[in-house]
Amino acid sequence: ECGHISVSAPIVHLGDPITASCIIKQNCSHLDPEPQILWRLGAELQPGGRQQRLSDGTQESIITLPHLNHTQAFLSCALNWGNSLQILDQVELRAGYPPAIPHNLSCLMNLTTSSLICQWEPGPETHLPTSFTLKSFKSRGNCQTQGDSILDCVPKDGQSHCSIPRKHLLLYQNMGIWVQAENALGTSMSPQLCLDPMDVVKLEPPMLRTMDPSPEAAPPQAGCLQLSWEPWQPGLHINQKCELRHKPQRGEASWALVGPLPLEALQYELCGLLPATAYTLQIRCIRWPLPGHWSDWSPSLELRTTERAPTHHHHHHHH
């Protein structure tokens, strides 16, 4: 190797200056007794190199690029060799930003997968490889005192969410949770959440059904629907409130909300609807009065109001 580049920093803030030095060893001087070292950033020649001969006979050129405005570029030093440019050495330069503080960190507890799923917004593009780590610890109090650390959760590349498995969770006990972002220019941490996984539980919705008409029960009145729901059994012991939404299948009507309904109601007569009209209905529930997240809306139930004897067809699909 005839030449070697060293740089003040290979990774800098976008727009910051960068200084580089290219040294040509003495035994390469046969190329030219007074070789002129040229600099190139990407495909563009860069003026302003200051060249000097050192006491040991090596040639050095130093250049300062006042603003590195490329997020990635190759800086090379070269010599004129006949009619062509002979590259002596090159380095990759990167420029970007330190990570912004991750924000909007939120978590939900999925009781079926037995995991706490946390998500966040990473902030603006840094233009540099940036790693995110979900960090957490167990705490007996309000997270002022740190208990056992929990194994870091590292999301897959490009994802802004991570799942903490059950074996690292303590239900009915607080956890401190935060996101750490790190790249070559710095580290940032989100504000810490302090939560009991059960307080962010997201339940599965009940399954809506038509009420089987019984011989002694009166048929629904005109503009009424009789329906029932089957709670998600594993969540049965969690006190919940639910809400129902409905809209006519035809037309552009928006959803009408009915609630709160206690999960235990299990059956309901919905009135004040248009007679002889097909309706789409859905239900969702939330842990209550204790904290929690709303479940997704249930699969739809399609029912038709009647003016006399009830008729219906049953159709489930996911929304």
Epitope: L171, P234, H237, A265
Partner: antibody, heavy 118, light 107 residues
Framework: EVQLLESGGGLVQPGGSLRLSCAAS????????MGWVRQAPGKGLEWVSS????????PYADSVKGRFTISRDNSKNTLYLQMNSLRAEDTAVYYC???????????WGQGTLVTVSS | DIQMTQSPSSLSASVGDRVTITCRAS??????LNWYQQKPGKAPKLLIY???NLQNGVPSRFSGSGSGTDFTLTISSLQPEDFATYYC?????????FGGGTKVEIK
């Protein structure tokens, strides 16, 4: 103190009836599911019935369905089990228990013995 | 109904031994598996809930693991007060069925 106290057990003839009570204290009774679990002499635990916080949902084991009725009075912090048409195989210690949100029995009474014999 | 099968039905062990009890559900129950300890003439006591969560006041030598259909209760170093009968119970669906029990006796 958080506790459950059963009463009402005793000796009853086959076909007879008995009503068990369970007085709760030290927690907000009206917020929790409650249940009855029994244990025949020298045998394991058997779920009998449960009741939701406001009393609207009352599942039963097949072995007692139609004969036993679970109920609660939230104003008195008391759980009940009305047992009719009793059989010899209903002989057991009956435990009243509080159910946690994940279906675990996190508080138990001391148990009351029901003996069905002629 | 979901059947719970516990094994072994009994075991003999010495103080300081590591003891493992297994429980198998007849269908998947996610993590809805609880463990209880019962001593003669006493009511059962909750040890572990939701497969691996230690109930308050229970010594850390007790631990639970597993999910789906296969679960394990481990006592890392058996103490004299641990000789008792242990039961698993599923809370995924009604009825809230128990395993047949495992009696841990002194060798």
């Amino acid at each position: 103190e958080v506790q459950l106290l059963e009463s009402g057990g005793g000796l009853v003839q086959p076909g007879g009836s008995l009503r068990l009570s369970c007085a709760a204290s030290g927690f907000t009774f009206s917020l929790y599911w409650m249940g009855w679990v029994r244990q025949a002499p020298g045998k394991g635990l058997e779920w009998v019935s449960s009741i939701s916080s406001s009393g609207g949902v009352t599942p039963y084991a097949d072995s007692v369905k139609g004969r036993f009725t679970i109920s609660r009075d939230n104003s008195k912090n008391t759980l009940y089990l009305q047992m009719n048409s009793l059989r010899a195989e209903d002989t057991a210690v009956y435990y009243c228990a509080k159910l946690g949100e994940l279906g675990m029995y996190d508080l138990w009474g001391q148990g009351t013995l029901v003996t069905v014999s002629s | 109904d979901i059947q719970m099968t516990q094994s072994p039905s009994s075991l003999s062990a010495s103080v300081g031994d590591r003891v493992t009890i297994t429980c198998r559900a007849s269908q998947g129950i996610s993590s809805y598996l609880n463990w209880y300890q019962q001593k003669p003439g006493k009511a059962p006591k909750l040890l572990i809930y939701y497969a691996s969560n230690l109930q308050n006041g229970v010594p850390s030598r007790f631990s639970g693991s597993g999910s789906g259909t296969d679960f394990t209760l481990t006592i890392s170093s058996l103490q004299p007060e641990d000789f008792a009968t242990y039961y698993c119970q599923q809370s995924w669906a009604y009825g809230l069925s128990f395993g047949g029990g495992t009696k841990v006796e002194i060798k």
